[in-house]
């Protein structure tokens, strides 16, 4: 959010950018939470739109029997490791080819025992309110497929007829991590020191992170003719003065006619 400044007062404005705003030669460039000529105003709405995609990571171990372990496989930059990685990735891409959420594999460690492969299976899905169910189902299919392939592709008479062979008993799922999307938590974090006053409200299943100064929501504060402004002590109504009236009260709902004040009489609407 930016506000442009022209004229002699600009240099003066530069040193007065507030709340972490920076001067770009023309205006104060404000951080996400602020706006105004000097970044003095707090925004009333923060974009916490759900991420486009949600990811999951499965930590798996399989034992490859069709390759003899050598010390070079421990070195991730070695020719041996790079070749193993390429073949293993190609094999896993075949194994998981029917899973739309499958993104790829990432080898974390190779160790002795034939070749014990510690790796992550990476999954991703478009964000929908049902993302958790989608990823839970995908992780189940991953387990089924890896169990099946490590049972079927085995050494016979000490030789492998497949791209890779496995030890049936060496397949383990260690851990499954799904990226959590918590709009309330995101809203609180992004509102920083104003976190107590920002809330999440939903419209068409989409979350909105708003303060009471944002109009049109159930928590919206009605300041009547005044202006809602956020401060560290919460939302407050700044009441206006017109040519004919002063406005006061918590929601600027009390109007005092100027002519009556000058005539030493008070009149409330």
């Amino acid at each position: 959010r930016t506000t442009t400044c022209f004229g002699d007062g600009c240099q003066n404005t530069a040193s007065r950018c507030k709340n972490g705003g920076t001067w770009d030669g023309l205006k104060c460039q404000c951080p996400n939470l602020y706006y105004g000529e000097l970044c003095e105003e707090v925004v009333s709405s923060i974009d916490i739109g759900p991420p486009e995609t949600i990811s999951a990571q499965m930590e798996l171990t399989v034992t490859v029997t069709s390759v003899k372990f050598t010390e070079e496989l421990k070195n991730h930059s070695s020719q041996e490791f790079q070749e193993f990685k390429q073949t293993f990735t190609e094999q896993m891409n075949i194994v998981y080819s029917g899973i739309p959420e499958y993104v790829g594999v990432n080898i974390t460690k190779l160790r002795l025992g034939s070749v014990v492969v510690e790796h992550d299976v990476l999954l991703r899905t478009k964000y929908t309110p049902e993302y958790k169910t989608v990823l839970d189902n995908a992780t189940e299919v991953v387990k089924e497929k890896i169990t099946k392939v490590t049972t079927q592709q085995i050494m016979i008479n000490d030789i492998c007829s497949d791209m890779m062979c496995f030890n049936t008993t060496g397949t383990q799922v260690q851990n499954i991590t799904v990226t959590q999307y918590d709009p309330e938590e995101d809203c609180r974090k992004m509102a920083k020191e104003y976190g107590d006053y920002f809330v999440v409200e939903y419209r068409d299943q989409k979350p909105y992170c708003i303060s009471p100064c944002e109009p049109g929501f159930s928590v919206s504060k009605n300041c009547n003719l005044g202006k809602c402004q956020m401060s560290l002590s919460g939302p407050q109504c700044l009441c206006v003065t017109t040519e004919t009236h002063w406005y006061s009260g918590e929601t600027c709902n009390q109007g005092t006619q100027k002519s009556l004040v000058y005539g030493h009489h008070h009149h409330h609407h």
């Epitope: 069709s66 003899k68 050598t70 390429q86 073949t87 007829s161 497949d162």
Partner: nanobody
């Protein structure tokens, strides 16, 4: 990158002999796997034999046992296939394959590096 160049193919009569060679370059280690595969017209590529260059393992397909011998010269980084008692069914394009891993698989998809192939024809 690993480069493989085969030589020694040709036409030979049944019962005759040939020696195929495959010169390898580009390895960072002196311990790796090399293999001979062959592909007859209209058939899938199949393993003939493989060897670990550290001498740890050799393997032969049942159809060539006792007639074909695989060997490797570490000093020359060259793979050989000594072919004796050749038969008409040995006619194929012979490919040299290699891997920086110590492989125990006869599936061609596991072998990343390949030569261009050399033709062996056994005919009277």
């Amino acid at each position: 990158d690993v480069q493989l160049v085969e030589s020694g193919g040709g036409v030979v009569q049944p019962g005759g002999s040939l020696r195929l060679s495959c010169a390898a370059s580009g390895y960072t280690s002196n311990r790796y796997s090399m293999a001979w595969f062959r592909q007859a017209p209209g058939k899938e590529r199949e393993v003939v034999a493989f060897i670990w260059t550290d001498g740890g393992r050799t393997y032969y397909a049942d159809s060539v046992k006792g007639r074909l011998t695989i060997s490797h010269d570490n000093a020359k980084n060259t793979l050989y296939l000594q072919m004796n008692s050749l038969r008409a069914e040995d006619t194929a394009v012979y490919y040299c394959a290699a891997s920086s891993l110590l492989l125990q698989t006869i599936n061609p998809r596991a072998w990343p590096y390949w030569g261009q192939g050399t033709m062996v024809t056994v005919s009277s």
